[in-house]
């Protein structure tokens, strides 16, 4: 008799990443009988929610339901109906909501409450919405990339199934850049983690990991730009800010009230004699770099060594995966290739920033002007953060791998978050089964 395929025995999970600038929904899938195997969970869908991050809905919470509808309906379509009720849904909010909570716990709670009520209306197993800590964001990003790279597997492969495979079990460090915060997470080499807040201990698949992590709130690319503008407008003589981080010929009016809306600019807040100012781009990488460096306080360090702002950072060790905005920005600038040296990246940034705005708009006609205008700043910021902030050098630059996806799954904290909450990363190495489960009879 002919073998007949059984219904696919799979499970699904949904994680919403409620970031500072936008929300993305990820759908994950894995074989039900291989839950404890490493590397079996993969992403089947990403849906980017149209609109800003959830923290921007503070004055219009009634619109949150509509905002989430399209992507939640997409999840309904992708996941078989029979699986809906057992598919967990998690929403994790990151630095945008951390900042809102700093301003008002009540407002942050109100937003999360409406989000929870909206998500509860769907036929899935809603597991809650919460603001994750910066430490969690760093840790789950580290778990995600190492899980996808097969670093937790004890089986050494003679063939490479993933890019960046170094054919050893040394874990990759994780560099995550968002709109409002940035995280650095890695296993230091035989180094005491001098600051307890930055130390994490994991036992995964029978192996112990002592992990360093830190999340720099206000140092995501969007908040770093607000900080820089707030700092620089204090040195401007008038309502014209000649800004080296924007292309020559670029002009944009900024409301002072918007500038001081975020807690990230509080340290620079002063009474200005105007309500608005105009950014006028002058497109000079070197001056932009210098201005950015002023956001990093490197004059104070209570430890053997620091990143900036007095935060402990052990010596860098091994390879690093740089993802989220690190990847998106460098991908746009065509600088993600392993062959591009740090000197070459700097050279390319100098040329890019110096290009006139009119020329840039013509060259990238399909890109939204708001995003297009900020790539000079963002690229320069990434270089400044990695080189002066985290102390990468021209030599260690080659250990940074700009990663968008690994094996079809986005690099980011969401997969690690779900793996943890669904208990799919065992502390001990699972016993290997002599026979694999057949899906045919």
């Amino acid at each position: 008799t002919q073998n007949k395929a059984l219904p696919e025995n799979v499970k699904y999970g949904i994680v919403l990443d409620a970031g500072s600038s936008h929300t993305s929904l990820y759908i994950y899938k894995w074989p039900a009988e291989k839950e404890n195997d490493t590397g079996v969970v993969h992403q089947v869908e990403e849906c980017r929610v149209k609109g800003p991050g959830i923290s921007k809905f503070v004055q219009k919470v009634n619109e949150i339901g509509i905002y989430l509808t399209d992507c939640m309906e997409r999840a309904r379509e992708v996941i078989p109906r029979s699986q809906h009720q057992e598919t967990p849904v998690y929403l994790g909010a990151t630095a945008g909501m951390r900042l809102l909570r700093m301003e008002s716990e009540e407002l942050a709670d109100r937003v999360l409450d409406v989000v929870e009520r909206s998500l509860s209306n769907y036929p899935f197993d809603f597991q809650g919405a919460r603001i994750i800590t910066g430490q969690e964001e760093g840790a789950y990003g580290w778990i995600t990339i190492n899980y996808l790279l097969g670093k937790f597997s004890q089986k050494t492969r003679w063939f490479s199934i993933v890019p960046y495979e170094t054919n050893n079990q040394e874990t990759f460090g994780a560099l995550d850049l968002g709109g409002a915060s940035t995280q650095v997470t890695f296993v230091p080499q035989n180094q005491t983690i001098e600051s307890p807040d930055n130390a994490l201990q994991f036992r995964l698949y029978g192996k112990d990991y002592n992990v360093y992590t830190h999340s720099f709130l206000c140092y995501g690319k969007d908040q770093a730009l607000w900080q820089k503008l707030a700092k620089d407008i204090q040195v401007a003589s008038n309502e014209i800010l000649r800004d080296p981080c924007f292309h020559p010929g670029y002009k944009k009016v900024v409301n002072v009230s918007d500038l001081y809306k975020t807690p990230c600019t509080k340290r620079f807040e002063m009474t200005l004699p105007f309500q608005q100012f105009e950014i006028q781009g002058i497109g000079n990488y070197q001056q932009c770099h210098q201005s950015i460096l002023e956001l990093f306080n490197t004059s104070y360090c209570p430890y053997s060594q620091c990143a900036f702002n007095g935060i402990f950072l052990p010596p860098l060790q091994g390879d690093f995966g740089a993802f989220s905005a690190f990847y998106f920005v460098m991908k746009f600038l065509n600088l993600t290739s392993e062959k591009v040296s740090q000197e070459k990246v700097t050279e390319m940034m100098k040329k890019f920033c110096a290009q006139p705005w009119e020329e840039i708009k013509t060259s990238y006609a399909g890109v939204k002007e708001k995003y297009l205008s900020e790539y000079c700043f963002s690229g320069t910021y990434i270089l400044s953060l990695l080189l002066q902030g985290y102390h990468f050098t021209a030599d260690s630059w080659e250990h940074i791998h700009f990663i968008g996806k690994i094996q079809g799954s986005d690099a980011g904290w969401t997969l690690g978050y779900m793996l943890n909450l669904t208990n799919m990363i065992p502390a001990e190495q699972p016993l290997s089964t002599p026979l694999s489960h057949s899906t045919y009879v």
């Epitope: 620089d232 008038n238 620079f268 002063m270 009474t271 210098q290």
Partner: antibody
Framework: QEQLEESGGGLVQPEGSLTLTCKAS?????????MCWVRQAPGKGLEWIGC???????TYYASWAKGRFTISKTSSTAVTLQMTGLTAADTATYFC???????????WGPGTLVTVSS | DIVMTQTPASVSEPVGGTVTIKCQAS??????LAWYQQKPGQPPKLLIY???NLASGVSSRFKGSRSGTEYTLTISDLECADAATYYC????????????FGGGTEVVVK
């Protein structure tokens, strides 16, 4: 040619008042300028008194100058510095300056001497 | 108000020598610093703005730099015409810090 010129200096009695005028020529006092006053006692260093932001009329003063010194814009080409309760310590050359923080906007007048003496 | 501490008060160097003047700000002023040159009977002349930018028409022998809250003016290849008093001025955050000057440094060229 852009120029600033101070006037109104001279001898004044202790506890007396005086108003100095700063006249701009070759340019108008447009909204994008800070117009400032700085003084220098004989043989001493420069001392910032205050500024007016032309665009909004907002004034800023050194903490020691608040109350006794008032900066105003009186026309499209002039700003004034009103001084009250003058003492011998206020004897100085008073400079008017256009403070635009780059290489093109910074402009100073030659100064006017104020002597407070009985 | 912010306090700008300028050192030394006076310095004497021969023609062709180098002079270094330092200015310490009591608060972080984020490169918001200007350097002026003043000769007797004249108003100050802007040399450097935003800590390290050379004003137009100023000789490249004048160099401004910054390290944290300490700012430095270096004059190299001294000429007789460089004999003057030099002042630093805060240019950051007028509403909070004002526009304080340093005490001045008299440069004598031998």
């Amino acid at each position: 040619q852009e120029q600033l010129e101070e006037s109104g200096g001279g001898l004044v009695q202790p506890e007396g008042s005086l108003t100095l005028t700063c006249k701009a020529s070759g340019f108008a006092l447009s909204s994008s300028y800070y117009m400032c006053w700085v003084r220098q006692a004989p043989g001493k260093g420069l001392e910032w008194i205050g500024c007016i932001y032309i665009g909004s009329g907002t004034t800023y003063y050194a903490s020691w100058a608040k109350g006794r010194f008032t900066i105003s814009k009186t026309s499209s080409t002039a700003v004034t510095l009103q001084m009250t309760g003058l003492t011998a310590a206020d004897t100085a050359t008073y400079f008017c300056a256009r403070d635009q923080y780059d290489d093109s906007g910074n402009l100073w007048g030659p100064g006017t001497l104020v002597t407070v003496s009985s | 108000d912010i306090v700008m501490t300028q050192t030394p008060a006076s310095v004497s160097e021969p023609v062709g020598g180098t002079v270094t003047i330092k200015c310490q700000a009591s608060q972080n002023i984020y490169s918001g610093l200007a350097w002026y040159q003043q000769k007797p009977g004249q108003p100050p002349k802007l040399l450097i703005y935003k800590a390290s930018n050379l004003a137009s028409g100023v000789s490249s022998r004048f160099k401004g730099s910054r390290s944290g809250t300490e700012y430095t003016l270096t004059i190299s290849d001294l000429e007789c015409a460089d004999a003057a008093t030099y002042y630093c001025q805060n240019w950051y955050g007028i509403s909070t810090y004002g526009r304080a000057f340093g005490g001045g440094t008299e440069v004598v060229v031998k």
